[in-house]
Amino acid sequence: MRTEAQVPALQPPEPGLEGAMGHRTLVLPWVLLTLCVTAGTPEVWVQVRMEATELSSFTIRCGFLGSGSISLVTVSWGGPNGAGGTTLAVLHPERGIRQWAPARQARWETQSSISLILEGSGASSPCANTTFCCKFASFPEGSWEACGSLPPSSDPGLSAPPTPAPILRADLAGILGVSGVLLFGCVYLLHLLRRHKHRPAPRLQPSRTSPQAPRARAWAPSQASQAALHVPYATINTSCRPATLDTAHPHGGPSWWASLPTHAAHRPQGPAAWASTPIPARGSFVSVENGLYAQAGERPPHTGPGLTLFPDPRGPRAMEGPLGVR
């Protein structure tokens, strides 16, 4: 089901002695408090595992820790999608799954996690120091990407938590802006509350409906998500890119995603009925990239079969523009 953070419809008491001023100072703290409570940052984790049975086989698992509805996932290797990475798979909860060699099987594990099996021998097979990246587009959070790779020393059959390397791009400015506003709001809220304490409580006329307390989102933001932003760096290893890239056929996934079927509120009857999957160790990284949906509510110029907005499907070697995929 699609869950969206909503600012509750507040019903403040009818203005008494304080009049309109009192009304405003009562409503504002609630709105700010709601924003503060719901301002948890989503996270993406990536887990890369080399299979013990076949040394050229990898399993990549990615998950999204957030309250939004996932609209698209893209998995790439050789770096982040849009920064030199080559698309391996694109998964949409309802519109289907597509993968390109050497990806063998992409599937949903739960409503918010996917797995991808990669296999191959020779030029097209991945190797231990390849970087794998997962990008989740969700509503209302936007798009979030994280990368991980197997350390060279990893024993086959063991899963290694990916490198904690946030992927930061131009859209970080948006996050910082929003964070700044929220931070200011929270500080202002505290200031208001302190001022309110030192004031005699105004006598208010009894209201017919008591003010509703703002409802927090159903998930508690984790400590990591509330921590200060790390210094951005990205470990992108291109020494193990497949030699056949220039002759291979994968189509790159889009550089940003915002495909939201308007009429479909249910989830697919995916594998294991969305059986719960254990979340890997916190080392699995966690990105701070958030491509906010500037046009999430807009309709396209046409009435497509349930599509509201399509991105530019930049191919694996397109490099057309700053977010293009090579």
């Epitope: 698209l72 519109r95 289907g96 996934g253 046409h302 497509g304």
Partner: antibody, heavy 119, light 107 residues
């Protein structure tokens, strides 16, 4: 309104080649992959392959490798399919169809181009 | 490649009747099955995807169901414009493959 306008019917001789076109309008051409689907007379649909208009990357069904070549001209929002070494087996209606992410559903279809191979 | 088997090959029905078309996949495709409708002399049109999601503008008398390998398309209270050929297609990877089609004819 999304429209895929295909070129007219073709009558070609065995062994020859033919190139048919599909012009997209009413949407951002690079937002959708262009697919080609073969429909033999009174028969089912067969996926030939698709092309990413952004960079010309192609994927073909095994059956059509060596038979079909897909190309695209972004500037004119037109996709092309060339069929070579034609035989009577290649006589069919060929449809172009646009697919949005993740490029496995055929969202919009052209009206079809009839190709007849006959001596 | 995933094979799609559709049945029946043809079906005669009258306006107002209810009909069901079935489609079987050679392997598990979860809910990734689409249905297309093709009217005489026209191109196919996407009707249903994800087994049961109707595309915009498709009347609610059409309903899809199934998951895994068994799927069906039901049309309640047939209207004259519903006659034509219906194809199923998996949307779980490539190559895209279609069923042989079910021709729905007016009785």
């Amino acid at each position: 309104e999304v429209q895929l306008q295909q070129s007219g019917p073709e009558l070609v001789k065995p062994g020859a080649s033919v190139k048919i076109s599909c012009k997209g309008s009413g949407y951002t051409f690079t937002d959708y992959f262009m697919n080609w689907v073969k429909q033999s007379h009174g028969k089912s649909l067969e996926w030939v392959g698709d092309i990413n208009p952004n960079n010309g990357d192609t994927t073909y069904s095994q059956k059509f490798m060596g038979k079909a070549t897909l190309t695209v001209d972004k500037s004119s929002s037109t996709a092309y399919m060339e069929l070579r070494s034609l035989t009577s087996e290649d006589s069919a209606v060929y449809h172009c169809a646009a697919s949005g992410p993740p490029y496995v559903l055929l969202d919009y279809w052209g009206q079809g181009t009839s190709v007849t191979v006959s001596s | 490649d995933i094979q799609m088997t559709q049945s029946p090959a043809s079906l005669s029905a009258s306006v107002g009747e209810t009909v069901t078309i079935t489609c079987r996949a050679s392997e598990n495709i979860y809910s990734y099955l689409a249905w297309y409708q093709q009217k005489q002399g026209k191109s196919p049109q996407l009707l249903v995807y994800n087994a049961k999601t109707l595309t915009e503008g498709v009347p609610t008398r059409f309903s899809g169901s199934g998951s895994g390998t068994q799927f069906s398309l039901k049309i309640d209270s047939l209207k004259p414009e519903d006659f034509g050929t219906y194809y199923c297609q998996h949307h779980y990877g490539t190559p895209l493959t279609f069923g042989a089609g079910t021709k729905l004819e007016l009785n």
